[in-house]
């Protein structure tokens, strides 16, 4: 799966919530960021994430004419220089400080499960999605034929506005 351009085709600033309307929040603890899934108090502002959208060629079409191969990949950055990344060994989702070019672990294939919900598939481990486990984000293996609608891998994006710079 190769990114077809070094620049994102578009970017947006959004808050991220689960299918059950819990918020994804980010907290700085001991000089590293922790990710939480929680019910927000009414007066608390939702954390924002910068989503950068990249076009990518699907592996099955890299040798062909590319007609069947376009996918959208996203990176998710809640704060400057930090990106959500897949830790496939630990089946976890972590926030790491990175410089561009970003590692493959920071890219997720975007799926629209319905017109108002999305899922994020790990670029480095196809079939594995960001999901919610024990009030934290984790990597969850999904059997495509059986659990396509698994609610724990469904998220809602509430876009704030188009965003140019962090």
């Amino acid at each position: 799966m190769s990114i077809t351009g070094i620049s994102p085709i578009t970017e947006s600033l959004a808050s991220l919530s689960t299918y059950n309307d819990q918020s994804i929040t980010f907290a700085l603890e001991d000089e590293s960021y922790e990710i939480y899934v929680e019910d927000l108090k009414k007066d608390k502002k939702k954390d924002k994430v910068l989503l950068s959208y990249y076009e990518s060629q699907h592996p099955s079409s890299e040798s062909g004419d590319g007609v069947d191969g376009k996918m959208l990949m996203v990176t998710l950055s809640p704060t400057k220089d930090f990106w959500l990344q897949a830790n496939n060994k630990e089946h976890s989702v972590e926030l790491h400080k990175s410089e561009k070019p970003l590692p493959d672990q920071a890219f997720f294939v975007l799926h629209n499960r319905s017109f108002n919900s999305v899922s994020f598939e790990s670029k480095t481990d196809p079939g594995v999605f960001i999901g919610v486990k024990d009030n934290h984000l984790a990597l969850i293996k999904v059997d495509y034929s059986e659990n396509l609608g698994s609610e724990n891998i469904l998220f809602k994006l509430s876009e704030i506005h188009h965003h140019h710079h962090h």
Partner: antibody, heavy 121, light 106 residues
Framework: EVQLVESGGGLVQPGGSLRLSCAAS????????MYWVRQAPGKGLEWVAS????????YYPDSVKGRFTISRDNAKNSLYLQMNSLRAEDTAVYYC??????????????WGQGTLVTVSS | DIQMTQSPSSLSASVGDRVTITCKAS??????LDWYQQKPGKAPKLLIY???NLQTGVPSRFSGSGSGTDFTLTISSLQPEDFATYYC????????FGGGTKVEIK
């Protein structure tokens, strides 16, 4: 090469039914959102129905909700539109369209050539 | 439901002219907007997606801009093959086409 070929159009009386088909080839059909879009004679484009890659979710505008049903058979690489209780205002060319990207509902990247449905007594 | 208002509904122009078509959304659609070109008797063709990205094979004289509720399609120097009808299309919340703009020969 991506190909979308619609069929099933024709003349039908008001209140009647028709089933349109779209045969897809040249791409991994089961990975794409699919759509029906129509165009009344001399008029603009109107989105009619959408369906997710696995067929689990479908969407319609109010103008056809309850009368039209979009479905798909991924094993046959085919998309369908069942149209019931047809009205004169449903007269249009009906296009089958494919999403621009794998898995996402953004943009209509490829279109068939359309099939004409005429509702008249 | 989101409404898309396109203007003008038609325009007359000459080869070499700069042509601008606008599309206004009834609510914020971020950058979830496409432009399609349709010639008589033919299926529509995707020109521009996500507001400003040119579909493969589309000439660079076509460009798109905007964000939120106001969007523009510009043809920098109109060519004979550009006489057609152009539609905007939003997919931020459901799916809606604009009414179309017919570009005719002056």
């Amino acid at each position: 090469e991506v190909q979308l070929v619609e069929s099933g159009g024709g003349l039908v009386q008001p209140g009647g039914s028709l089933r349109l088909s779209c045969a897809a080839s040249g791409f991994t059909f089961s990975s794409y959102w699919m759509y029906w879009v129509r165009q009344a004679p001399g008029k603009g484009l109107e989105w009619v129905a959408s369906i997710t890659p696995n067929g689990g979710n479908t969407y319609y505008p109010d103008s056809v909700k309850g009368r039209f049903t979009i479905s798909r058979d991924n094993a046959k690489n085919s998309l369908y539109l069942q149209m019931n209780s047809l009205r004169a205002e449903d007269t249009a060319v009906y296009y089958c369209a494919r999403g621009h990207y794998y898995y996402t509902s953004y943009s209509l990247g490829y279109w068939g050539q359309g099939t004409l449905v005429t509702v008249s007594s | 439901d989101i409404q898309m208002t396109q203007s003008p509904s038609s325009l007359s122009a000459s080869v070499g002219d700069r042509v601008t078509i606008t599309c206004k959304a009834s609510q914020n659609i971020n950058k979830h907007l496409d432009w399609y070109q349709q010639k008589p008797g033919k299926a529509p063709k995707l020109l521009i997606y996500f507001t400003n990205n040119l579909q493969t094979g589309v000439p660079s004289r076509f460009s798109g801009s905007g964000s939120g509720t106001d969007f523009t399609l510009t043809i920098s120097s109109l060519q004979p093959e550009d006489f057609a009808t152009y539609y905007c299309f939003q997919y931020n919340n459901g799916w809606t086409f604009g009414g179309g703009t017919k570009v005719e020969i002056k």
